[in-house]
C-alpha cells in the first residue's frame, strides 16, 4: 500500500550512523531500512561530536542534518567491513548508533504506558551530553521507586548537547509484565522511528541500555551460524520486519485511502488534523480525549462531546503523539520523520472513547462475585471522578493565573468555562453512579430470582422424596426462606436508593414495590402450605419451623421499622450516595391510615400443623396444585404431595384482589402462572416461582 510522499517525506527509516573501531562506519539506508557500509570505503570510528555530525552530513547529503544524538539503546549490526576488504562477514557487533537529526530539533514522542508517568527536566543554565541526561532521568525514576522506561533529549544547545530530558517512569513490576504496552510501542516505534530495523523492535519494551543487554547479544550469537550460511544480505531480517506491517494493514485503513484525495499528501493531512483546535462538538457528553496543541507543541487532554468536532481527537496521548508529535515539527514534515509507507497512519475518528473500569463492569455479565465486582467498579468510578475533578481544578487555577491580566469579561468567560466543566463532570459522575447502581440492582435481582427458584425447587423436591426426610426438608425450607428474605431486602433497598436519588421516580414505583412485596408474601404462604400437605414431616419439624418463622417475622419488623424511622439505608459504599439532609421523614411506603399494618407484610403467621389459616381478605388461599379429581374441598393436612400428576396441569391461575383505600393503584392484580415444565414433577410448583417480577 503506497502512501503519497513529497520528496524525502516517505523515508523508511531514521538516518543514523554506527561505528565500531577497526571496522568501516555503517549508516542506515533510509530507503530500505538496512545498515550500509561507508560509501567511500575509508571512514572508520570518529572521536569527536563535530566529526560525527559532519559524517552524518556526508552520508546523507540530500537531508538537512543539523545535529546528532546518541541513540537510547544499542543495536546489533552484522556485516562490518574492514578497510580495503570486499568480504564483510564478521561477528555481529552490539553498538550504540548516533541518530542524525534532520532540520529543526523536535523532541521525541515518548509513549506513556498505563500506570507510567511522563516527566521532564529543563535547566537553561546547563548544557550537557546525552549520557548526563540519561543519568538524570534514571536517577529521577529511581528516587520515585520506578524504572526508567524511555527518554529523549530536549532543547539542544550544541552538538549532542542538550538543556533537558523528557522521560517516562514506570512502576517496578510493570516493566517486566506489562506486555500490552510493549506491544503497543512496537507497533508505533516502527512507524515513527525504526523502519525495518528489527533490533529497534526487539528492544522496544525497555529502551534503557543496561537492561537485557547480555540476553540480546547471546541471542544474536546463537543465530549467527544460520545467518552466515543463509542470510547473505539480511533478507531474513527484512522479512521478519514486514510481518507486523501486514497485520497492521489489515487492522486499519490507510490515511491515503480514507481521508485524503489522491493529490493530497499524508503530510498535508496530518498537518491539517494536528493543527485544528480541540473541538468539543455540539453534543454534551464528557469523553476524555487528547488533541495536539500547536501552541505548546504537545498533546493535551480535552473533553469531547461525543459527536461532531474534528479529527484532532485521539483516544490516548500516545496515539496523539504518534500521529502529531513528530509530524507537527514542521521542518520534519519536509524531511524524514513522516508517516511511513510500511504502516499507514491511523487517524482518529469521533467514535466513543475506550472503555474504562466502569464500562468494563457494565459490559461483563454478572456472576457469583457480583458484589465484589460492583464494589470495585464503584471505587474505580469514584477514583476516576476525583482524579478528573482535581485535574480540572488544577487547570482552572492555571487558567486563572494566566488570565489575571485579561479584561474582566474575558476572566469571567474563563471562570464560566471551568464552572461548566465542573458541573458537567458532576453530572457525568452522577449518571455513571446511577447506571452502575441500576445495573448492579438488575443483576442482583436476576441472581435472587435464580437462587429463589432453585431453593424452591429443592424444597419441593425434598417434600416429594419417598420417604421424605424432615431434617432435609427443614434445611431446604430455611434456604428458601432466606432467598425470599434477600429478595425483599433487595427490593426495599432498591426502593430506598431510588427514593434518595429520585423522589419522583420513587413515588411512581411505590405501588410496584408494594405489589412485589405482596407477591413475596403470597409465594411464601403458598410454599409453607405445601409443608402441611405432608403432615408427618410438618409435625416433626414444627418447633424449628415456628422458630424460623418467628425470626423471619422479627427480621421483617426490623427492616420495615428501620425504613420508617431512618430513611438512609447505605447501599454498600456511601461514597456512591448523595448525602441526605438531617431530616428523618417517614418513608411513604406504607399507608398510614391504620388499614395496613406491618403484619400485612409478614409472609405468614405462625400456625400449628392442624390449623390452616383462614382465607381472609388479605391472605390468598394457598394453591392446591393437584388435579381436580384428587383434590378435596379444602386443603388440609394429610392430603399428601406424592401423587401429583403434573401432566394434567395446563395452567394455574390466581386472582388476588387487593382492596386498599390508601391510594395505591393495586386493585385487581391478576397473577397468572403457567406450568411450563409439563411432564416433570416440578410443573406443579411453577406457579410458586413468580417469574415476572413486578418491580420496575
Amino acid at each position: 500500500l503506497e502512501v503519497p510522499t513529497d520528496g524525502n517525506a516517505g523515508l523508511l527509516a531514521e538516518p543514523q550512523i554506527a561505528m565500531f573501531c577497526g571496522r568501516l562506519n555503517m549508516h542506515m539506508n533510509v530507503q530500505n531500512g538496512k545498515w550500509d557500509s561507508d560509501p567511500s570505503g575509508t571512514k572508520t570510528c570518529i572521536d569527536t561530536k563535530e566529526g560525527i555530525l559532519q559524517y552524518c552530513q556526508e552520508v546523507y547529503p540530500e537531508l538537512q542534518i543539523t545535529n546528532v544524538v546518541e541513540a537510547n539503546q544499542p543495536v546489533t549490526i552484522q556485516n562490518w567491513c574492514k578497510r580495503g576488504r570486499k568480504q564483510c562477514k564478521t561477528h555481529p557487533h552490539f553498538v550504540i548508533p548516533y541518530r542524525c537529526l534532520v532540520g529543526e530539533f523536535v523532541s521525541d514522542a515518548l509513549l506513556v504506558p498505563d500506570k507510567c508517568k511522563f516527566l521532564h527536566q529543563e535547566r537553561m543554565d546547563v548544557c550537557e551530553t546525552h549520557l548526563h541526561w540519561h543519568t538524570v532521568a534514571k536517577e529521577t525514576c529511581s528516587e520515585k521507586s520506578t524504572n526508567l522506561h524511555d527518554y529523549g533529549m530536549l532543547l539542544p544547545c550544541g552538538i549532542d548537547k542538550f538543556r533537558g530530558v523528557e522521560f517516562v517512569c514506570c512502576p517496578l513490576a510493570e516493566e517486566s509484565d506489562n506486555v500490552d504496552s510493549a506491544d503497543a510501542e512496537e507497533d508505533d516505534s516502527d512507524v515513527w522511528w525504526g523502519g525495518a530495523d528489527t533490533d529497534y523492535a526487539d528492544g522496544s519494551e525497555d529502551k534503557v541500555v543496561e537492561v537485557a543487554e547480555e540476553e540480546e547479544v547471546a541471542e544474536v550469537e546463537e543465530e549467527e551460524a544460520d545467518d552466515d550460511e543463509d542470510d547473505e544480505d539480511g533478507d531474513e531480517v527484512e522479512e521478519e520486519a514486514e510481518e507486523p506491517y501486514e497485520e497492521a494493514t489489515e487492522r486499519t485503513t490507510s490515511i491515503a485511502t480514507t481521508t485524503t484525495t489522491t493529490t493530497e499528501s499524508v503530510e498535508e493531512v496530518v498537518r491539517e488534523v494536528c493543527s485544528e483546535q480541540a473541538e468539543t462538538g455540539p453534543c454534551r457528553a464528557m469523553i476524555s480525549r487528547w488533541y495536539f496543541d500547536v501552541t505548546e507543541g504537545k498533546c493535551a487532554p480535552f473533553f469531547y462531546g461525543g459527536c461532531g468536532g474534528n479529527r484532532n481527537n485521539f483516544d490516548t496521548e500516545e496515539y496523539c503523539m504518534a500521529v502529531c508529535g513528530s509530524a507537527m515539527s514542521q521542518s520534519l514534515l519536509k524531511t524524514t520523520q513522516e508517516p511511513l509507507a510500511r504502516d499507514p497512519v491511523k487517524l482518529p475518528t469521533t467514535a466513543a472513547s475506550t472503555p474504562d473500569a466502569v464500562d468494563k463492569y457494565l459490559e461483563t455479565p454478572g456472576d457469583e462475585n457480583e458484589h465484589a465486582h460492583f464494589q470495585k467498579a464503584k471505587e474505580r468510578l469514584e477514583a476516576k471522578h476525583r482524579e478528573r475533578m482535581s485535574q480540572v481544578m488544577r487547570e482552572w487555577e492555571e487558567a486563572e493565573r494566566q488570565a489575571k491580566n485579561l479584561p474582566k469579561a474575558d476572566k469571567k468567560a474563563v471562570i464560566q468555562h471551568f464552572q461548566e466543566k465542573v458541573e458537567s463532570l458532576e453530572q457525568e459522575a452522577a449518571n455513571e453512579r446511577q447506571q452502575l447502581v441500576e445495573t448492579h440492582m438488575a443483576r442482583v435481582e436476576a441472581m435472587l430470582n435464580d437462587r429463589r427458584r432453585l431453593a424452591l425447587e429443592n424444597y419441593i423436591t425434598a417434600l416429594q422424596a419417598v420417604p421424605p426426610r424432615p431434617r432435609h426438608v427443614f434445611n431446604m425450607l430455611k434456604k428458601y426462606v432466606r432467598a425470599e428474605q434477600k429478595d425483599r431486602q433487595h427490593t426495599l433497598k432498591h426502593f430506598e436508593h431510588v427514593r434518595m436519588v429520585d423522589p419522583k421516580k420513587a413515588a411512581q414505583i411505590r405501588s410496584q414495590v408494594m405489589t412485589h412485596l405482596r407477591v413475596i408474601y403470597e409465594r411464601m404462604n403458598q410454599s409453607l402450605s405445601l409443608l402441611y400437605n405432608v403432615p408427618a414431616v410438618a409435625e416433626e419439624i414444627q418447633d424449628e419451623v415456628d422458630e424460623l418463622l418467628q425470626k423471619e417475622q422479627n427480621y421483617s419488623d426490623d427492616v420495615l421499622a428501620n425504613m420508617i424511622s431512618e430513611p438512609r439505608i447505605s447501599y454498600g459504599n456511601d461514597a456512591l450516595m448523595p448525602s441526605l439532609t438531617e431530616t428523618k421523614t417517614t418513608v411513604e411506603l406504607l399507608p398510614v391510615n391504620g388499614e395496613f399494618s406491618l403484619d400485612d407484610l409478614q409472609p405468614w403467621h405462625s400456625f400449628g400443623a392442624d390449623s390452616v389459616p383462614a382465607n381472609t381478605e388479605n391472605e390468598v388461599e394457598p394453591v392446591d396444585a393437584r388435579p381436580a379429581a384428587d383434590r378435596g374441598l379444602t386443603t388440609r393436612p394429610g392430603s399428601g404431595l406424592t401423587n401429583i400428576k403434573t401432566e394434567e396441569i395446563s395452567e394455574v391461575k390466581m386472582d388476588a384482589e387487593f382492596r386498599h383505600d390508601s391510594g395505591y393503584e393495586v386493585h385487581h392484580q391478576k397473577l397468572v402462572f403457567f406450568a411450563e415444565d409439563v411432564g416433570s414433577n416440578k410443573g406443579a410448583i411453577i406457579g410458586l416461582m413468580v417469574g415476572g417480577v413486578v418491580i420496575a
Epitope: Q391, Q402, N405
Partner: antibody, heavy 126, light 107 residues
Framework: EVQLVESGGGLVQPGGSLRLSCAAS????????MNWVRQAPGKGLEWVSY????????YYADSVKGRFTISRDNAKNSLYLQMNSLRDEDTAVYYC???????????????????WGQGTTVTVSS | DIQMTQSPSSVSASVGDRVTITCRAS??????LAWFQQKPGKAPKLLIY???SLQSGVPSRFSGSGSGTDFTLTISSLQPEDFATYYC?????????FGQGTKVEIK
C-alpha cells in the same frame, strides 16, 4: 506600562547575518508566547516565527526556515531572532509581538497578538 | 498553509459610513481569527480577537463576526481616525497567516 522594544536592525549584505533583540517590560514575559512579524516596504504583514512560553514549541514561516532562529531568555525578559544567510527579500521592518493565550491542558483560548513593538528596520542590500 | 483572502483590497468611504471588510480562509479555522488596524509608519493594533471579541480600549463601532471560513469586520460609523489599512490573521494553525490587507481611504 506594557512595552516591547526591538533593536539590532541595520544594513547588511546578502548572505550576511544579523541578530534582532526585543526587550519586554511591564508584564510577566515568561507567561506569554512571542512572535516576530515583518513588513516589507509597501507590502502587507508577514508572520515570521513563534516561540511558546517555555520554548517547547517553535515555528517558522517556510520563507525563513533553516536560516532564522528564534529564541528567548525569560530571565532577561528578552526575545531574539538570529538571521543568517540573509536575502534581498528579507528587507523589512521587523516587529516583535506578544501573543496572549490561555492554554491549559483542558482549555485553549486565543486573545490575539495584542502588544507590538515599534519595529526595527533590516535592509539587505549589496 | 491556510491562505487568507481579504476583500476588497481598498474601499473609499466618508465619515459616518458603514464599512464592511470580509476575510475568507482557505480552510476552516473555527473562530480563531483576529483583525488589526495599521496606520502608516506605525505598528499594527489589535481590534478584534476570536472572530468577534472586541479588544479592550477599542471603540464599539468596530465589530467582528463569522466562523469557519468566512469572517467580517464592520465599522458601523466611520470616524476620521479610522482611515487605515486593516488585516485579518488566522490563529488556528502554524504557520500563522495574514490577509493581504484592505485600505480604507477617504472618499
Amino acid at each position: 506600562e506594557v512595552q516591547l522594544v526591538e533593536s539590532g536592525g541595520g544594513l547588511v549584505q546578502p548572505g550576511g547575518s544579523l541578530r534582532l533583540s526585543c526587550a519586554a517590560s511591564g508584564f510577566t514575559f515568561s507567561s506569554y508566547s512571542m512572535n516576530w512579524v515583518r513588513q516589507a516596504p509597501g507590502k502587507g504583514l508577514e508572520w515570521v516565527s513563534y516561540i511558546s512560553r517555555s520554548s517547547s514549541a517553535i515555528y517558522y514561516a517556510d520563507s525563513v526556515k533553516g536560516r532564522f532562529t528564534i529564541s528567548r531568555d525569560n530571565a532577561k525578559n528578552s526575545l531574539y531572532l538570529q538571521m543568517n544567510s540573509l536575502r534581498d527579500e528579507d528587507t523589512a521592518v521587523y516587529y516583535c509581538a506578544r501573543e496572549t493565550t490561555v492554554t491549559t491542558r483542558f482549555y485553549y483560548y486565543y486573545y490575539g497578538v495584542d502588544v507590538w513593538g515599534q519595529g526595527t528596520t533590516v535592509t539587505v542590500s549589496s | 498553509d491556510i491562505q487568507m483572502t481579504q476583500s476588497p483590497s481598498s474601499v473609499s468611504a466618508s465619515v459616518g459610513d458603514r464599512v464592511t471588510i470580509t476575510c475568507r480562509a482557505s480552510q476552516g479555522i473555527s473562530s480563531w481569527l483576529a483583525w488589526f488596524q495599521q496606520k502608516p509608519g506605525k505598528a499594527p493594533k489589535l481590534l478584534i480577537y476570536a472572530a468577534s471579541s472586541l479588544q479592550s480600549g477599542v471603540p464599539s463601532r468596530f465589530s467582528g463576526s463569522g466562523s469557519g471560513t468566512d469572517f467580517t469586520l464592520t465599522i458601523s460609523s466611520l470616524q476620521p481616525e479610522d482611515f487605515a489599512t486593516y488585516y485579518c490573521q488566522q490563529a488556528n494553525s502554524f504557520p500563522r497567516t495574514f490577509g493581504q490587507g484592505t485600505k480604507v481611504e477617504i472618499k
